[in-house]
């Protein structure tokens, strides 16, 4: 993420641009893009960005719609950076278990787990 | 995920087993495991389960500690299933944009984005 714009501001601006250009983006009635069937979005970042690439190649560019896709590419870069940080530091078992407990706790309270 | 136990119950039981066996698991003082340096856990599932694999190979098995690792492998399978569902259905651009907006909205409100 560039030092020029914090990630949080980038996400906010991108949401606004997405709203602005929605009509232009949905112009292609025949295009089909893979859409995840659950709401655990972070698991699907690869597919989301592949979809954005498909959409970008189908969209008439210029002006702020170009900025929308540029922002999305910066968000992709940010997430790539976060993924790199997943395995960067080796720590004691104690600290790993804290993280695992936290992960399962989040899964328990925040994940959308469909009932079987 | 087996039909015998819902994923939510599995996660709850695993949290309890993790608490029970903590002392046994941290017995190896020299072992170092990669621990993510941020709290966007879903981005790091691969690294988390690699860490669990490392821990299991270093832990004396038997009794309910075996059940803990069995549960964790079922959770890994469940997450794998969720990841498969990321690109299963091709839908209209409209629906893709809804998902993208939702993803960015979640990023905006729930992600821990470090300030620069």
């Amino acid at each position: 993420i560039p030092t020029e714009i914090p990630a949080s501001a980038l996400v906010k601006e991108t949401l606004a641009l997405l709203s602005t250009h929605r009509t232009l983006l949905i112009a292609n009635e025949t295009l089909r893009i893979p859409v995840p069937v659950h709401k655990n979005h972070q698991l699907c970042t690869e597919e989301i960005f592949q979809g954005i690439g498909t959409l970008e190649s189908q969209t008439v560019q210029g002006g702020t719609v170009e900025r929308l896709f540029k922002n999305l590419s910066l968000i992709k870069k940010y997430i790539g950076g976060q993924k790199k940080k997943c395995g960067e530091e080796r720590r004691r078992v104690n600290q790993f278990l804290d993280y695992l407990q936290e992960f399962l706790g989040v899964m328990n309270t925040e994940w959308i787990i469909e009932s079987h | 995920i087996p039909t015998e136990i819902p994923a939510s119950a599995l996660v709850k039981e695993t949290l309890a087993l993790l608490s029970t066996h903590r002392t046994l698991l941290i017995a190896n003082e020299t072992l170092r495991i990669p621990v993510p340096v941020h709290k966007n856990h879903q981005l790091c599932t691969e690294e988390i389960f690699q860490g669990i694999g490392t821990l299991e190979s270093q832990t004396v098995q038997g009794g309910t500690v075996e059940r803990l690792f069995k549960n964790l492998s079922l959770i890994k399978k469940y997450i794998g299933g969720q990841k498969k569902k990321c690109g299963e259905e091709r839908r209209r651009v409209n629906q893709f944009l809804d998902y993208l907006q939702e993803f960015l909205g979640v990023m905006n409100t729930e992600w821990i984005i470090e300030s620069h």
Partner: antibody, heavy 120, light 107 residues
């Protein structure tokens, strides 16, 4: 393998128009955006603009907006650059290039270039 | 428009020597930089993109680094076939802009 084949050298009179082509092969033409770049003799590179063969959209460098027109023909996998009302300033080599990916605005493949000479 | 100031304009190096070229952007460009090699009478060839990613098939003696507004391109161990012009390009914003080039010759 990926290839971009450009039309041959052109000698043009001042005030005339010139149209050059860039034929793509070895990949799906509509999957990649084609950019055009100008290189004046012994000088650096100047971006003219791009054409999206899929959407038909284009974007121009302000400096070339009134001079260049970018088009493409999907059926023959060919992109075109047309220069109008040429002057001696337009004498240069013109390259087409393929953008590497939606989130990387660089060119992984270039055509061999078309040399344009403006002379009466 | 983003200006890309490239230096030096020309450079001569002995075989095996390490060579470095710098590009300074007029604003932060978030690592959106590519480096191209252009041999005499040929079209440019992509060597490095996204500041430090090596394009497929490019020898590992070529590398890129930098962040913010300052970016560097390095050849670790000059070879005879490296004699060429080198250009940087920013891909952060349109209009896309290039550096003025560095002519690299063998001493």
């Amino acid at each position: 393998q990926v290839k971009l084949l450009q039309s041959g050298a052109a000698l043009v009179k001042p005030g005339d128009s010139v149209k050059m082509s860039c034929k793509a092969s070895g990949y799906t033409f509509t999957d990649y955006i084609i950019h055009w770049v100008k290189q004046s003799h012994g000088k650096s590179l100047e971006w003219i603009g791009y054409f999206n063969p899929n959407s038909g959209g284009s974007n121009y460098n302000e400096n070339f907006k009134r001079k260049a027109t970018l088009t493409a023909d999907k059926s023959s996998s060919t992109a075109y650059l047309e220069f109008s009302r040429v002057t001696s300033e337009d004498s240069a080599i013109y390259y087409c290039g393929r953008r590497i990916a939606w989130d990387h605005w660089y060119f992984d493949f270039w055509g061999p270039g078309t040399m344009v000479t403006v002379s009466s | 428009d983003i200006q890309m100031t490239q230096s030096p304009a020309s450079l001569s190096a002995s075989l095996g020597e390490t060579v470095s070229i710098e590009c300074l952007a007029s604003e932060g460009i978030s690592n959106d930089v590519a480096w191209y090699q252009q041999k005499s009478g040929r079209s440019p060839q992509l060597l490095v993109y996204a500041a430090s990613r090596l394009q497929d098939g490019v020898p590992s003696r070529f590398s890129g680094s930098g962040s913010g507004t300052r970016y560097f391109f390095k050849i670790s161990g000059m070879q005879p076939e490296d004699e060429a012009d080198y250009f940087c390009q920013q891909g952060y914003k349109t209009p896309l802009t290039f550096g003025s080039g560095t002519k690299l010759e063998i001493k």
